[in-house]
Structure formats: structure tokens, C-alpha cells
């Protein structure tokens, strides 16, 4: 396993609709044709997998149908979007990139993006 640099933004604020987007960029050390991208969430020293996708270079990033993530790839950067976020989902979201094929295998893990999610206030009843 060889190490690889990964960059991602330090902080992102989710929209009022609970959507957060960020770029994950990796320093590809060679001609990888198969890449796997995983988003991990770290909160209270617990790390859980949020979503993952494997893609072939030049093709679209495809997550499972029930995934809360969507994304697009362009060269050695991936544009990730996480949907359905609520305040309790606030945490550090880490981008993990693996160059699966051809060998050698490379692994890169970013420093994480702190995503802040604020639940919208309910609209007050209006007396009209």
C-alpha cells in the first residue's frame, strides 16, 4: 500500500435544505483507471462510512440508489454532494481515495471537512 495526498476544504456549511457539497482532490501518482472514493464521518471518535463509489476514469461516479451521496468526477478531483443532512449529522467528513487498478494500490485520506448543519426554524404561524 502506497500513500497518496488528498485535499479537501476545512469547513462547509450545509444549505437550509440539508445539502452540503465539497471537492475532494487527490495527487494521482500514475495512470489509474479504477478509483474508489469513500466518505467517512468522524464524530465523538467514532468513524462510520457514509457512502462509497467506484468509478472508471472518464465515467460518471455511481453511488448506490439508496445513497445519500451523489458526485461527479473530473480528472483527479471529485465533486461530492451529501443530502438529507440534519443538525445531528454535523461532524468531520473525511474523503478517502483508493487507486484500485492497475497496481500498485494507492491509498489517500484527507484531513476531513467539518460540515455544519443547522436545522431550519419552523415558520411562525401568521395571524391574517
Amino acid at each position: 500500500c502506497k500513500a497518496m495526498h488528498v485535499a479537501q476544504p476545512a469547513v462547509v456549511l450545509a444549505s437550509s435544505r440539508g445539502i452540503a457539497s465539497f471537492v475532494c482532490e487527490y495527487a494521482s501518482p500514475g495512470k489509474a483507471t479504477e478509483v474508489r472514493v469513500t466518505v467517512l464521518r468522524q464524530a465523538d471518535s467514532q468513524v462510520t462510512e457514509v457512502c462509497a463509489a467506484t468509478y472508471m476514469m472518464g465515467n460518471e461516479l455511481t453511488f448506490l440508489d439508496d445513497s445519500i451521496c451523489t458526485g461527479t468526477s473530473s480528472g483527479n478531483q471529485v465533486n461530492l454532494t451529501i443530502q438529507g443532512l440534519r443538525a445531528m449529522d454535523t461532524g468531520l467528513y473525511i474523503c478517502k481515495v483508493e487507486l484500485m487498478y492497475p497496481p500498485p494500490y494507492y491509498l489517500g485520506i484527507g484531513n476531513g471537512t467539518q460540515i455544519y448543519v443547522i436545522d431550519p426554524e419552523p415558520c411562525p404561524d401568521s395571524d391574517f
Epitope: H5, V6, A7, Q8, V23, E25, Y26, A27, S28, P29, G30, K31, A32, T33, M57, G58, G75, N76, Q77
Partner: nanobody, 126 residues
């Protein structure tokens, strides 16, 4: 749309040095990571080096590490490849390529670059 033009190639004796330039027009190069590649007749294109947008991140394959150095001058919209201790097997057409990125990294994979120069010939011979 950024356009790239390589220069600085030519004939050099074994053991000699050359500095190649990759000049950009049409856009500011500071928005782009830049890579250098070469292709010898009958061979696949080979990665040589890359440099991130700010110049703080560079990468080289083992084959040229220590002999080749990549630098950039964003004020001149130019990236340079300094090549020392040249050998006959370094004879090839040398290309630079650019990729618009968000952060400071760069890629050694030709698949990641979407803008290429026309190339400059380097011949190492006595």
C-alpha cells in the same frame, strides 16, 4: 480557454542540460496544475513531473527524480522543466499539459489533463 506552448527543446550532448518552458495564454495559469510528459517514437507517453497551482506541491516518478526539476512563475504564466544529466534515452517530444483544480495538488496521470501543448523536440546525442 487556456492554450499552452512549449519551448526550449533542441539538440544537446549527453550529460548536458536543458530548460523547457511551458507558456500559457488565454487564461491565468495559476488556476491550473501543470504536468510534463514525453513520448519517444514507438513508445507510450511517459509522465515526468507535475506541479500544483501554487507551486508548493510537486511530484516526480522514480525514473527522473533527482535529474529533473519542475518550477513555475505565475507572474509570467509559465512553468519550467529543468533537465540535467541528460542521456540518449531522454530523446523524445516533450509536452506540457494543464488541468484546472481547486486545491494545491497535481497529477502524474495523463488521463487527468484536458489541455495539451503541441510539444517540443529534445534530442540527446553526441
Amino acid at each position: 480557454e487556456v492554450q499552452l506552448v512549449e519551448s526550449g527543446g533542441g539538440l544537446v550532448q549527453p550529460g548536458g542540460s536543458l530548460r523547457l518552458s511551458c507558456a500559457a495564454s488565454g487564461d491565468t495559469l495559476e488556476s491550473f496544475a501543470v504536468g510534463w510528459f514525453r513520448q519517444a517514437p514507438g513508445k507510450e507517453r511517459e509522465e515526468l513531473s507535475c506541479i500544483g497551482r501554487t507551486g508548493e506541491f510537486t511530484d516526480y516518478p522514480g525514473s527522473v527524480k533527482g535529474r529533473f526539476t519542475i518550477t513555475r512563475d505565475n507572474s509570467k504564466n509559465t512553468v519550467y522543466l529543468q533537465m540535467n544529466s541528460l542521456r540518449a534515452e531522454d530523446t523524445a517530444v516533450y509536452y506540457c499539459a494543464a488541468e484546472r483544480l481547486v486545491f494545491h495538488l497535481c497529477s502524474l496521470s495523463e488521463y487527468d489533463y484536458d489541455t495539451w501543448g503541441q510539444g517540443t523536440q529534445v534530442t540527446v546525442s553526441s
